[in-house]
């Protein structure tokens, strides 16, 4: 399975030597080192950390480690003019103000440069008006408000709870509904697990804790001022009015103590059903406006943040391949944090650091991988995946010709229950085989494999005896590699029990309380889950870089394509009359999927039988595997989303975090019954079926015998 070219370590010991070198104690030490001060993108502290990582990766033994800098649009609060929200009385007097900062956690009271909670890229403004509670501000929440309840958000300030979908989608939805401001808050129903104490006594969100985050709708563009191209020294920058994805209304986040004060006064309509109620002792009335006694009071936002072009720094390390140096396997994760980054990103960065150290140790002993491994510490992920996207834009020609795989390495943990993997179907078998070889860290699974505990705790909804592997969405640095460039990608981390913990993400996400102590005291005291994630991520990189034949199974793509085709067909069949009227047929898509399945099967047979000692044939077969993901890229991109070019997967138009299959068809069908011109709408469905069918067929043909 693994190559022994250019190595003095026997093949069967390659992977074992690499995995055995990974140590939990080192990950712990690295995490501590990375989390003592804030590392906000664009700050001196994060530049210094970049230089430290560059220096340490060199010491670990990488062939070269360079800084790649870009000048991108970032957003910061005004230090002398803080952001806040008030309740004002009829005379305009501020009778209540939200807090200006989170109470610092114990031991961090004297740390400087803790950025106060803010919504990055919010425009400035001081709107005042009546409040409307919009639940999670999802598409369906606004449908409920506008269509069923006949509540108009135009000219109102909306208050939405965090969770379920990416915050940028919430803001976009509010803008489209005509709101003039958005208040985001963390409801305990979503960010407070029952029976657990709040930080510092447990891992729950305290009432003064607030989630920071960007509110962009970039759709894969990277730096808002230089879409499609790197933000380098000679870049042409758009004016701010033409920038991609910026919100047009002020937005600000608050904690649940402050939210209580706003929501307890709400009047107007009662919530439509129990799914609109959180856990605060408030009526969750929708509004608009406050109840009886308080009906003359209004809400006023005071937002003074500024957008600034600022320099950011990626760290790019190279471990040159011995046999195929022009084939790149990339392991990347971000370095910038909102505050201390105890989980996001440094639990991931610490794992990457240890993986680099282990690879470096092997290299010092004379070993090299077959293919080149690139290691990346990305900057400005929190501001819209900017560091990774700018680097990929700068290196797109190399990447599209040489990129074998990208493994993402943000937060290693979001819980300590079981493994969570999202990846291309090409990597399913790699992940299955690898996890069968790794030991489970879980209590009650001593001596059992990771595959076994993962499958038991997170079973596949379709295939018994197999674990759940999810679709890639976005919201992290794999986006440009997978959705734009079509490089096979995957991510792995330890997660919570989704059955019992229905809160969104982890409670302290993007708050000041995301500290080293949070991880060391409550999530992973022995760092055994971090070590397991290091073994999974590192093991995937090792196999991708070192297997003689790339560990991709194209038959797994065939299986999911059929599943996705069935799903989108059943969605369309909710409109049987229109399908008949407008002659909508999925025959071409099912035919293409059938062809793909047959060709993939034959390719797999050839893959078993070909002469692996023939370097030309080996390279040819590997190239077919490498370029299969690329074959799903449509150079024209998806409608109105030119940087989302993958035809099989895209981030959901309603939730950036979620992956949608056959997104072009899905979006064309979405809410089609409300379209003013049904003929045009169904015409677009037909066009998207055509694009999908063509793409699947074209991808299948890349797997056919070359001549």
């Amino acid at each position: 399975k693994s190559s022994n070219e250019a190595t003095n370590i026997t093949p069967k010991h390659n992977m074992k030597a690499f995995l055995d070198e990974l140590k939990a104690e080192n990950i712990k030490k690295f995490l501590y080192n990375f989390t003592q001060i804030p590392h906000l993108a664009g700050t001196e502290q994060n530049f210094q950390l970049a230089k430290q990582i560059q220096s340490q990766w060199k010491e670990f033994g990488l062939d070269s480690v360079e800084l790649a800098h870009y000048d991108v649009l970032l957003s910061y609060p005004n230090k002398t003019h803080p952001n806040y929200i008030s309740i004002i009385n009829e005379d305009g007097n501020e009778i209540f103000n939200t807090s200006l900062f989170e109470p610092p956690p114990p031991g961090y009271e004297n740390v400087s440069d803790i950025v106060p909670p803010f919504s990055a890229f919010s425009p400035q403004g001081m709107p005042e008006g009546d409040l409307v509670y919009v639940n999670y501000a999802r598409t369906e929440d606004f449908f409920k408000l506008e269509r069923d309840m006949k509540i108009n958000c135009s000219g109102k300030i909306v208050i939405a709870r965090y969770g379920k979908v990416f915050r940028g989608n919430k803001v976009k939805n509010a803008q489209l509904a005509g709101a003039k401001g958005v208040i985001l808050y963390s409801d305990p129903a979503d960010y407070f697990a029952p029976g657990v104490k709040s930080y510092p006594d447990g891992w729950n969100l305290p009432g003064g804790g607030v989630q920071r985050g960007n509110i962009l709708n970039l759709n894969g563009a990277g730096d808002p001022l230089t879409p499609g191209y790197p933000a380098n020294e000679y870049a042409y920058r758009r004016g701010i009015a033409e920038a991609v994805g910026l919100p047009s209304i002020p937005v600000h986040p608050i904690g649940y103590y402050d939210a209580q004060k706003l929501l307890e006064k709400m009047g107007g309509s009662a919530p439509p059903d129990s799914s609109w109620r959180g856990s605060l002792k408030v009526p969750y009335n929708v509004g608009p406006g406050f109840t009886g006694n308080f009906s003359t009071q209004k809400v006023k936002m005071h937002i003074h943040s500024t957008n600034e072009v600022t320099r950011i720094y990626n760290v790019i390390g190279t471990l040159r391949g011995a046999v195929e140096p022009d084939r790149y396997v990339i392991l990347g994760g971000h370095r910038d944090s909102w505050v201390f980054g105890g989980i996001d990103p440094q639990s991931g960065a610490a794992v990457v650091h240890e993986i680099v150290r282990s690879f470096g140790t092997l290299k010092k002993e004379g070993w090299r991988p077959r293919r080149t491994i690139l290691f990346a510490s990305w900057d400005a992920e929190e501001f819209g995946l900017l560091g990774s996207t700018e680097w990929a834009e700068e290196n797109s020609r190399l990447l599209q010709e040489r990129g074998v795989a990208y493994i993402n390495a943000d937060s290693s943990i979001e819980g300590n229950y079981t493994l969570r993997v999202d990846c291309t179907p090409l990597m399913y078998s790699l992940v299955h085989n690898l996890t069968k070889e790794l030991k489970s860290p879980d209590e009650g699974f001593e001596g059992k494999s990771l595959y076994e505990s993962w499958t038991k705790k997170s079973p596949s909804p379709e295939f018994s005896g197999m674990p759940r592997i999810s679709k890639l969405g976005s919201g992290n640095d794999f986006e440009v590699f997978f959705q734009r460039l079509g490089i096979a990608s995957g991510r792995a981390r330890y997660t919570k029990n989704w059955e019992t913990n229905k809160f969104s993400g982890y409670p302290l996400y993007h708050s000041v309380y995301e500290t080293y102590e949070l991880v060391e005291k409550f999530y992973d005291p022995m760092f055994k889950y971090h070590l397991t994630v290091a073994q999974v991520r590192g093991g995937m990189v090792f196999e991708l870089a070192n297997s003689i034949v790339l560990p991709f199974d194209c038959r797994d793509y065939a299986v999911v394509l059929r599943k996705y085709a069935d799903k989108i067909y059943s969605i369309s069949m909710k409109h049987p009359q229109e399908m008949k009227t407008y002659s909508v047929s999925f025959d071409s898509l099912f035919s293409a999927v059938k062809n793909f399945t047959e060709i993939a099967s034959k390719f797999s047979e050839r893959l078993q039988d070909f002469d692996k000692s023939n370097p030309i044939v080996l390279r040819m077969m590997n190239d077919q595997l490498m370029f299969l993901e690329r074959a799903f890229i449509d150079p024209l991109g998806l409608p109105d989303r030119p940087f989302y070019r993958h035809v099989i997967y895209a981030p959901s138009s309603h939730n950036k975090y979620a992956g949608e299959s056959f997104p072009g068809i899905y979006d064309a069908l979405f809410d089609i019954e409300s379209k003013v011109d049904p003929s045009k709408a169904w015409g677009e469905v037909k066009r998207q079926i055509y694009v999908a069918a063509f793409t699947v067929q074209a991808a299948a043909e890349t797997l056919s015998e070359v001549a």
Partner: antibody, heavy 120, light 112 residues
Framework: QVQLVQSGAEVKKPGASVKLSCKAS????????INWVRQTPEQGLEWMGG????????NYNENFKGRVTMTRDTSSSTAYMELSRLRSDDTAVYYC?????????????WGQGTTVTVSS | DVVMTQSPLSLPVTLGEPASISCRSS???????????LHWYQQKPGQSPRLLIY???NRFSGVPDRFSGSGSGTDFTLKISRVEAEDVGVYFC?????????FGQGTKLEIK
């Protein structure tokens, strides 16, 4: 740690007013409502009302409306309760208590109590 | 106003034995968000009341696990699995679902 320290005992004549104070420490004063509860052997514990230090909004028990006034001074983290037109049956121990907010929504911290005696 | 009725009003118990106090409300204490804001307070002789159990069954921090709460709707119970000498005092149930907040008359626990 959370602490509520109340002013000292008071002796008042019927018809007079009394103003009690409750100084809070160990937490962010504006986040938590302050309730006033009195205790008599006859009536047991009686909730008189509460104030939100953040915006000064008050919520009074109808039984005391017109006689009770609750205020706060955020600069000194102090809540006040004034009871006017005192009667002999207002003789009681008066407690301030912090409303615990989520997840409790119960009075999670109490002052030591102030004894008010109304006697001619 | 919501009337809270406790029974018994006096409860003599032998050390180490269990104790149970009942509390009934005149209307449902379920709030619109599904939570029930029924709490239990303990008042030791010469002291202020202190929170023991919140939202029916949740022990407040520092409260020994021999104390437990249960119930729903209008009927609630406080149990002490094994009474200790330090448990002597008056126990009040209270509701904060409806304004005005109201308390039970109190149950005096004493050692036999």
């Amino acid at each position: 740690q959370v602490q509520l320290v109340q002013s000292g005992a008071e002796v008042k004549k019927p018809g007079a007013s009394v103003k009690l104070s409750c100084k809070a420490s160990g937490y962010t004063f504006t986040y938590f409502d302050i309730n006033w509860v009195r205790q008599t052997p006859e009536q047991g514990l009686e909730w008189m009302g509460g104030i939100s230090p953040g915006d000064g909004n008050t919520n009074y028990n109808e039984n005391f409306k017109g006689r009770v006034t609750m205020t706060r001074d955020t600069s000194s983290s102090t809540a006040y309760m004034e009871l006017s037109r005192l009667r002999s049956d207002d003789t009681a121990v008066y407690y301030c208590a912090r409303d615990g907010n989520f997840p409790y929504y119960a009075m999670d911290s109490w002052g030591q109590g102030t004894t008010v005696t109304v006697s001619s | 106003d919501v009337v809270m009725t406790q029974s018994p009003l006096s409860l003599p118990v032998t050390l180490g034995e269990p104790a149970s106090i009942s509390c009934r409300s005149s209307q449902s204490l379920v709030y619109s968000n599904g939570n029930t804001y029924l709490h239990w307070y303990q008042q030791k002789p010469g002291q202020s009341p202190r929170l023991l159990i919140y939202k029916v069954s949740n022990r407040f921090s520092g409260v020994p696990d021999r104390f437990s709460g249960s119930g729903s709707g209008t009927d609630f119970t406080l149990k002490i699995s094994r009474v200790e000498a330090e448990d002597v005092g008056v126990y009040f149930c209270s509701q904060s679902t409806h304004v005005p907040y109201t308390f039970g008359q109190g149950t005096k626990l004493e050692i036999k």
